[in-house]
């Protein structure tokens, strides 16, 4: 009696179970009563990443430098190429099909989390006691200076964008 279901890594065709092609190979011809499934390795720049009965391998992803992409991991016959973004850029999606420039944190804000190839810079406002006077994708807020530690006195208080200004002790008011 012909089978209605096949084992793992097999497929049903013409009332018989044939072996699937292993990852990295494509199907050339189905098995018969007398012959095994015929498979062929994927060509250069092609891959198949599962046990399959595909007659065509997939093309490796192209990391287009015009979109800010570069190869993070070269593809094999069993794996696709993995793209990432050039330094200073991050992917616009999980699939990393294009890149955008990392955001900079404006004065008054510091970097909470530095951007990666897949996530943008996360900024946070500098709280009272801290400042940032630059636009930066790397700098955290800096603490205000304590003038006393330098044997000076405060002449002007800090803001979220400026440090405290210190001056000599004998300053006339």
């Amino acid at each position: 009696e012909p089978p209605t279901a096949c084992r793992e890594k097999q497929y049903l065709i013409n009332s018989q179970c044939c072996s699937l092609c292993q990852p990295g190979q494509k199907l050339v011809s189905d098995c018969t009563e007398f012959t095994e499934t015929e498979c062929l390795p994927c060509g250069e720049s092609e891959f198949l990443d599962t046990w399959n009965r595909e007659t065509h391998c997939h093309q490796h992803k192209y990391c287009d430098p015009n979109l800010g992409l570069r190869v993070q991991q070269k593809g094999t016959s069993e794996t696709d190429t993995i793209c990432t973004c050039e330094e200073g850029w991050h992917c616009t999606s999980e699939a990393c099909e294009s890149c955008v420039l990392h955001r900079s944190c404006s004065p008054g804000f510091g970097v909470k989390q530095i951007a990666t190839g897949v996530s943008d810079t996360i900024c946070e406002p500098c709280p009272v006691g801290f400042f940032s006077n630059v636009s930066s994708a790397f700098e955290k807020c800096h603490p205000w200076t304590s003038c006393e530690t330098k044997d000076l006195v405060v002449q002007q208080a800090g803001t979220n964008k400026t440090d405290v200004v210190c001056g000599p002790q004998d300053r006339l008011r």
Epitope: E124, P127, W144
Partner: antibody
């Protein structure tokens, strides 16, 4: 110990100005912010602004710019707040409080007893 | 401006009961650079000045009884009085000191049944 002593209650006419004082003792007056807070019945607490006596630097709540002016005299350890062009909306109790160190920030840990200002014609 | 919202606006409790009040901020008060929450709690008894109870969201001010506990992080904070005493009759305010202008919550009035 740290103490903040405020001036007494004031009864003022609309359009007039009033100057409230806050004398600090028991700590280095110049290096801590002096905060000013308004309290009207049923209105909770409202931050007016602050002055750093050592430098004269100030931060104002936008809602009080042009209404409140802060000054400080380090020789007498006294901070002042002047309120101008008084209206009935300015009738309230005004508190001074010690804020954080100038290079650190922080909560208001000592408070004056409050100065009641009543504006009435 | 950072908006501070307190709830409930008032509550009546019996002596010995546990009291919990909430304070929410419109933006995070946690600064990643020092892992501090820029939030304070104050107690104001009738006819008196406010008194600092808790700073950095959870640190009890010197001399404050240990029945008062501050907790929470980011935008959600809680003040708990583990076993209320008659002398705790007051209005409790939260305040953020993360950024200017400093802002207070509307207060929670604790009444004794």
């Amino acid at each position: 110990q740290v103490q903040l002593q405020q001036s007494g209650a004031e009864l003022m006419k609309p359009g007039a100005s009033v100057k409230i004082s806050c004398k600090a003792t028991g700590y280095t007056f110049s290096t801590y912010w002096i905060e000013w807070v308004k309290q009207r019945p049923g209105h909770g607490l409202e931050w007016i602004g602050e002055i750093l006596p050592g430098s004269g630097s100030t931060n104002y709540n936008e809602n009080f710019k042009g209404k409140a002016t802060f000054t400080a005299d380090t020789s007498s350890n006294t901070a002042y707040m002047q309120l101008s062009s008084l209206t009935s909306e300015d009738s309230a109790v005004y508190f001074c409080a010690r804020g954080g160190l100038y290079y650190y920030g922080g909560a208001m840990d000592y408070w004056g007893q409050g100065t009641s200002v009543t504006v009435s014609s | 401006d950072i908006v501070m919202s307190q709830s409930p606006s008032s509550l009546a409790v019996s002596v010995g009961e546990k009291v919990t009040m909430s304070c929410k901020s419109s933006q995070s008060l946690l600064y990643s650079g020092n892992q501090k929450n820029y939030l304070a709690w104050y107690q104001q008894k009738p006819g008196q000045s406010p008194k600092l109870l808790i700073y950095w969201a959870s640190i009890r001010e010197s001399g404050v009884p240990d029945r008062f506990t501050g907790s929470g992080s980011g935008t959600d904070f809680t003040l708990t009085i583990s076993s209320v005493k008659a002398e705790d009759l007051a209005v409790y305010y939260c305040q953020q000191y993360y950024s200017y202008p400093y802002t207070f919550g509307g207060g929670t009035k604790v009444e004794i049944k």
